[in-house]
Each structure stands twice: as structure tokens, then as C-alpha cells.
Interface confidence: low
């Protein structure tokens, strides 16, 4: 299998994640999911003991040479080797295709075959706990052991025959080598083919490294422990059928005595440490909706009680290539609208018994700021704004326009890039804010783009509450109140006085307060008051009044 990309740092789900347990695991830990065992979501593999050097070894009979250094052990695995590869191993390096569960050995060893080595054949039916290679079904010893030929001085003079027998568990060898030592001290080596039946290993030795997969039945809420052996073993009290121990209750220890006709007493006593029921754990998304665009929170929840020691339960998360040994993780400063993949597993006594993967898409982020192209008023009651939309996802726009302390907002379709504002007030400064928003887990508003314009001038409204009062025989006092709408930049009050169709006075004041003197007596006058805003006059307010006959 080709190497996969190795992302750095927290990556989105676009990056393939590395296996969660690819980092060194503690001794006695099952490696993460290289096997069909872990294609079942809630399986659980357990190695009950560490690899023993006695599991597969080269044994020398008690009659062997006194001087052990006389052996040339080149090509023969020593007793310290946790696993002796089969001759098939050297021909079939099929890493990654083995269907057995990887179990922890004393050093979590994974030994590859050495090319050209004289490998003692593995035992059919013996489960390899530390190798990724499949066991070859052929078991005869394919090479003979080699004695040192270079030094006869090292060998004491003896006349007895010494038989060196290589054993691997219950292998039955069909070849052996006999060394006859002559009285002169020289070694005469002859190879004969004889049928030797070595003593059987003890079942305790043979099954020292048995692995167990726990299969959970969600209906019965009971576990089945599957013993990973190739032969049909016998269990004390007939507790197993077809290498399976059924109806195991969560959080209870069960003892199984394992025997087989290929091994002798003592039997292997296997302690099954049953994990909690997998449905008692739930991977919960604990992300706050307000922050769901840039954060992810994942938390394992215990949704039911159990009697297992919670201190034996550990949690592991991997998101990208970041690994967390926490029950709850919070990832921050993420990209909005990105898929992030997090894998998680729960271990009981360092053995995985359930796992879950979540691909979480961060929520839509706040949209970007629209780019206003222009914003202006071309009439007294109208304005126009045009813009380019933001690049991030959004649902709609909100356009607000503020005049003085009044604020009006409109919801605009996402496809609009121009809006004509109607019914505006003349000669009024409008501040416009335009933002995009998206309705996600919560509504997120983008940054607002701002602009402003002042509408064109328009005629002001009428002055009001106009009064004309006589102050003397030939004098009048004219007053009025300002117009409600000035609609222009300036403020000036005008008074026109007419007699018949003749304009007799035209005055302009800052305030609407006029004193008209020296009028003719007993004359009808028309008084017209209006407001001028610098651009337009307003409609005049008209009152008629007559001077009296002179009292003198």
C-alpha cells in the first residue's frame, strides 16, 4: 500500500487522516483497526498476556553439548525472539492484508522476515500475536540446524549421541540432526531422517498469547468473546462453543480454562475482562451554536450507568494528525463551512471496545462584506445603491437606512446588486448600511458596508399658524411658525404685501416676525408669508387684512 499524505497540524476532512493508534501504544494494547475484526464497529480485541519467550523457541535437549558456545546460531532464531517468521513469510510479505487482530507483545514487536534466514516453520493453528504476516499451513522443518564445524577443541570427548530438537509449540518435526562425538574429540556430523515426536507444550504455554475479540449484541446486551485460535479448543465446564464464550455480562470478569489435545496440562486460564456495553457511550456534538462556524466540540457521554471502573476507561480523539487523550475536545479557530473529520475510540484497560468517526462540517461563517460600488441620490425622494456581493455563502441582504434617529431596514433578495430607495425625505442625509446574512445554526450577519448621501432639495412645506394683527392705524404685525419640512439647505422667511394686484412690500427675515408700517388707511391688503430653503420657496400662507380709517 502506498504511503498516504501526512498532513501537518489540524486539517480539514479533505486531508486523509492517519490511523488513530499509529502512535506507539502502551504495552498490551491492540493496534488500531488493521483487521477485519475492526470492521465491526464495536469489537474489542484483548491480549491476555504478554508474549513469552517460551512461546516459540529453539530447545536443546538435556543431553546437549556442555559448551553451548559451540553452536553456530546463524539463521536460527534465538529464544529472545518473540516470533519466528515462517518460510512463507519470506515469500509473501503481505503487510496490511492480514485479517488477524494486532495484539500487544512485550515490545509491541512486528518482525519482518530476514531474507535468506533459516526460519523454523510456524505452527499451524498457532495465532501469531506480533506479526503482520499470515501463517503458512505447511509445517515441516525445511532446514536443518547447523553445528559449528570450525572448532573441535571446544567439544569435550564423549561417546554419547546428542540429538538437537527444534520445537515450536506442537510442531511435529520430520527431520533432526545427530552429532556423534568420538573419543578423540572430533565431531562427526551425520544427518539422518528419523521421526521424532517431541514432548507437547503445556496449554498454558501454547495459549499464552491468545487474543480475544469481544462482540456485542445490542439486543441481548451481552458480549461474546471469540477466542482467536485456529483449532477447536475445549473449555472447562463446556463454557465455549466453536471457540466462542457466549453471554458475557458487561463489567464482569469471567474465567475460562482452555485445553486441547495438542498440549498438556496445565491448561491456560484465561481471564476475560468484559468491557462496558457500547450503547452506554454516545459521541455528542457539544459545539455551541453561536461558535459553530469556527469551533468543534466533541464529547463522549455516558448515557447509562455501568459498574466497570471508569478509571480503566480512556478516550482518544484524532482530528487530522492531532491526537487528544480526553473525553471532550474543543477545536478552535477553524475555517467555516469546512468538513473536519474526527475519529475517536474508547479503550477499556487499554483495549479498544468502541469507536466512532464524525465528519463535522463547521457552520456557515459570517458572510463577507459587500463592496458598494456607488450610493447617491438623484432626486428629492429617491436614492440608489449598487454593490458587489460578498464571496462567502449567504442567504440574503439587509439594507438599513438611517435618517437622523430613524432607522428603516429592508430584507433584500440575495441576487440583487442594486436597490432603488423610494419615498425618501428631501434634503436629508441618509446613512446606509448593507450587510449579507446567512441563516445557519444561528443567523450570522456579515460586516456591514456603509455609505451615505443627501437627497436633493424640494419645496418646503407651508408656514403655519400665521397671524396678522394691527399695531396702529397704519401698522401691522405678521407672525408665523416654521414649516414642518424645510427640504433644503437654508432658512429664510418672506412676506409679500399686496394692495389690489400691486405688490407694495417684499421683506425677508431670518425669523417669521414682520412689522409692516406706513400702510395706507382704510385699504384692503393681502399678506403672503412663505419659507424659502435656498433652492425652493414654499407655498405661501395667505391672509387678508384692512387698515382702519385714520383716527386722527
Amino acid at each position: 500500500q502506498s504511503p498516504t499524505p501526512s498532513p501537518t497540524g489540524l486539517t480539514t476532512a479533505k486531508m486523509p487522516s492517519v490511523p488513530l493508534s499509529s502512535d506507539p501504544l502502551p504495552t498490551h494494547t491492540t493496534a488500531f483497526s488493521p483487521a477485519s475484526t475492526f470492521e465491526r464497529e464495536n469489537d474489542f480485541s484483548e491480549t491476555t498476556t504478554s508474549l513469552s519467550p517460551d512461546n516459540t523457541s529453539t530447545q536443546v535437549s538435556p543431553d546437549s553439548l556442555d559448551n553451548a558456545s559451540a553452536f553456530n546460531t546463524t539463521g536460527v532464531s534465538s529464544v529472545q525472539t518473540p516470533h519466528l517468521p515462517t518460510h512463507a513469510d519470506s515469500q509473501t510479505p503481505s503487510a496490511g492484508t492480514d485479517t488477524q487482530t494486532f495484539s500487544g507483545s512485550a515490545a509491541n514487536a512486528k518482525l519482518n522476515p530476514t531474507p535468506g534466514s533459516n526460519a523454523i516453520s510456524d505452527v499451524p493453528g498457532e495465532r501469531s500475536t506480533a506479526s503482520t504476516f499470515p501463517t503458512d499451513p505447511v509445517s515441516p522443518l525445511t532446514t536443518t540446524l547447523s553445528l559449528a564445524h570450525h572448532s573441535s577443541a571446544a567439544l569435550p570427548a564423549r561417546t554419547s549421541n546428542t540429538t538437537i530438537t527444534a520445537n515450536t509449540s506442537d510442531a511435529y518435526l520430520n527431520a533432526s540432526e545427530t552429532t556423534t562425538l568420538s573419543p578423540s574429540g572430533s565431531a562427526v556430523i551425520s544427518t539422518t531422517t528419523i521421526a521424532t515426536t517431541p514432548s507437547k507444550p503445556t496449554c498454558d504455554e501454547k495459549y499464552a498469547n491468545i487474543t480475544v475479540d469481544y462482540l456485542y449484541n445490542k439486543e441481548t446486551k451481552l458480549f461474546t468473546a471469540k477466542l482467536n485460535v485456529n483449532e477447536n479448543v475445549e473449555c472447562g465446564n463446556n463454557t465455549c462453543t466453536n471457540n466462542e464464550v457466549h453471554n458475557l455480562t458487561e463489567c464482569k470478569n469471567a474465567s475460562v480454562s482452555i485445553s486441547h489435545n495438542s498440549c498438556t496440562a496445565p491448561d491456560k486460564t484465561l481471564i476475560l475482562d468484559v468491557p462496558p456495553g457500547v450503547e452506554k457511550f454516545q459521541l455528542h456534538d457539544c459545539t455551541q451554536v453561536e461558535k459553530a462556524d469556527t469551533t468543534i466540540c466533541l464529547k463522549w457521554k455516558n448515557i447509562e450507568t455501568f459498574t466497570c471502573d471508569t478509571q480503566n476507561i480512556t478516550y482518544r480523539f484524532q482530528c487530522g494528525n492531532m491526537i487528544f487523550d480526553n473525553k471532550e475536545i474543543k477545536l478552535e479557530n477553524l475555517e467555516p463551512e469546512h468538513e473536519y473529520k474526527c475519529d475517536s475510540e474508547i479503550l477499556y484497560n487499554n483495549h479498544k471496545f468502541t469507536n466512532a468517526s464524525k465528519i463535522i462540517k463547521t457552520d456557515f461563517g459570517s458572510p463577507g462584506e459587500p463592496q458598494i460600488i456607488f450610493c447617491r441620490s438623484e432626486a428629492a425622494h429617491q436614492g440608489v445603491i449598487t454593490w458587489n456581493p460578498p464571496q462567502r455563502s449567504f442567504h440574503n441582504f439587509t439594507l438599513c437606512y438611517i435618517k437622523e434617529t430613524e432607522k428603516d431596514c429592508l430584507n433584500l433578495d440575495k441576487n440583487l446588486i442594486k436597490y432603488d430607495l423610494q419615498n425618501l425625505k428631501p434634503y436629508t442625509k441618509y446613512v446606509l448600511s448593507l450587510h449579507a446574512y446567512i441563516i445557519a445554526k444561528v443567523q450570522r450577519n456579515g460586516s456591514a458596508a456603509m455609505c451615505h448621501f443627501t437627497t436633493k432639495s424640494a419645496p418646503p412645506s407651508q408656514v403655519w399658524n400665521m397671524t396678522v394683527s394691527m399695531t396702529s392705524d397704519n401698522s401691522m404685525h405678521v407672525k408665523c411658525r416654521p414649516p414642518r419640512d424645510r427640504n433644503g439647505p437654508h432658512e429664510r422667511y418672506h412676506l409679500e404685501v399686496e394692495a389690489g394686484n400691486t405688490l407694495v412690500r417684499n421683506e425677508s427675515h431670518k425669523n417669521c416676525d414682520f412689522r409692516v408700517k406706513d400702510l395706507q388707511y382704510s385699504t384692503d391688503y393681502t399678506f403672503k408669508a412663505y419659507f424659502h430653503n435656498g433652492d425652493y420657496p414654499g407655498e405661501p400662507f395667505i391672509l387678508h387684512h384692512s387698515t382702519s380709517y385714520n383716527s386722527k
Epitope: T4, S17, V18, F32, E339
Partner: nanobody, 119 residues
Framework: EVQLVESGGGLVQAGGSLRLSCAAS????????MGWFRQAPGAERVVVAI???????YYVDSVKGRFTMSRDNSKNTVYLQMNSLKPEDTAVYYC?????????????WGQGTQVTVSS
């Protein structure tokens, strides 16, 4: 196990187009994540595009707007349409799958197809 076979690579001038195909056999891949990766000489294999089983597609920034990944579930095939090719797109292109309950990573790599973009 899924077997993947890529095809469609070749020599093309800068600005040209190619369409890569990845035919899957052994399993229907419609419900699995599929990815296109590439490996330039002397460099690591890197992701180009991923079609998630949920329907969304990811593109690395350098190919956004130029490359399009699609699926034809009836043919059990994924495609990578590559337009506006640049010399820096020269690499061996691989497709890969991430099945639900097997590896946590993309796996079942094909043999790859060479894409060479000349300037």
C-alpha cells in the same frame, strides 16, 4: 476489497485539458468517500480533490475553479476534469477510496496515471 484503476493521463500543453477516470471494482463506491491525489517527482503524495459520501466536494486551493471532480455511480467511476492545466500540475495522479468501516485513511490506491503539462 475495492480495486481502482486510473486512466486518462497523458502529455498536454499548458492551458489544455484532460479528464481522468477512476474505475472501481469489487464494491460499489457510491456511499464511500473518494479522493484524487497527486505526487510530483521527489514530493509527497498530496490531496487534490475529495468527493465526500455526503455529497460535498473539496478542492485544494491550487486547483479551485480549474478542476472538477464528479461521480458516475452507474459506472462505479469517478472523474477528474482538469482544465487550464499548468506545468505545476505535472504529477502522477492517483485515486483512492475511504470505505466506512475499514481504514480511517484513504486506501486501495490505484497504480496511478501520469499527467505531464509542458510549457
Amino acid at each position: 476489497e475495492v480495486q481502482l484503476v486510473e486512466s486518462g493521463g497523458g502529455l498536454v500543453q499548458a492551458g489544455g485539458s484532460l479528464r481522468l477516470s477512476c474505475a472501481a471494482s469489487g464494491r460499489t463506491v457510491s456511499r464511500y468517500d473518494m479522493g484524487w491525489f497527486r505526487q510530483a517527482p521527489g514530493a509527497e503524495r498530496v490531496v487534490v480533490a475529495i468527493s465526500w459520501s455526503g455529497g460535498s466536494t473539496y478542492y485544494v486551493d491550487s486547483v479551485k475553479g480549474r478542476f472538477t471532480m464528479s461521480r458516475d455511480n452507474s459506472k462505479n467511476t469517478v472523474y477528474l476534469q482538469m482544465n487550464s492545466l499548468k506545468p505545476e500540475d505535472t504529477a502522477v495522479y492517483y485515486c483512492a477510496v475511504r470505505t466506512e468501516r475499514s481504514s480511517l485513511d484513504f486506501h486501495s490506491w490505484g497504480q496511478g496515471t501520469q499527467v505531464t503539462v509542458s510549457s
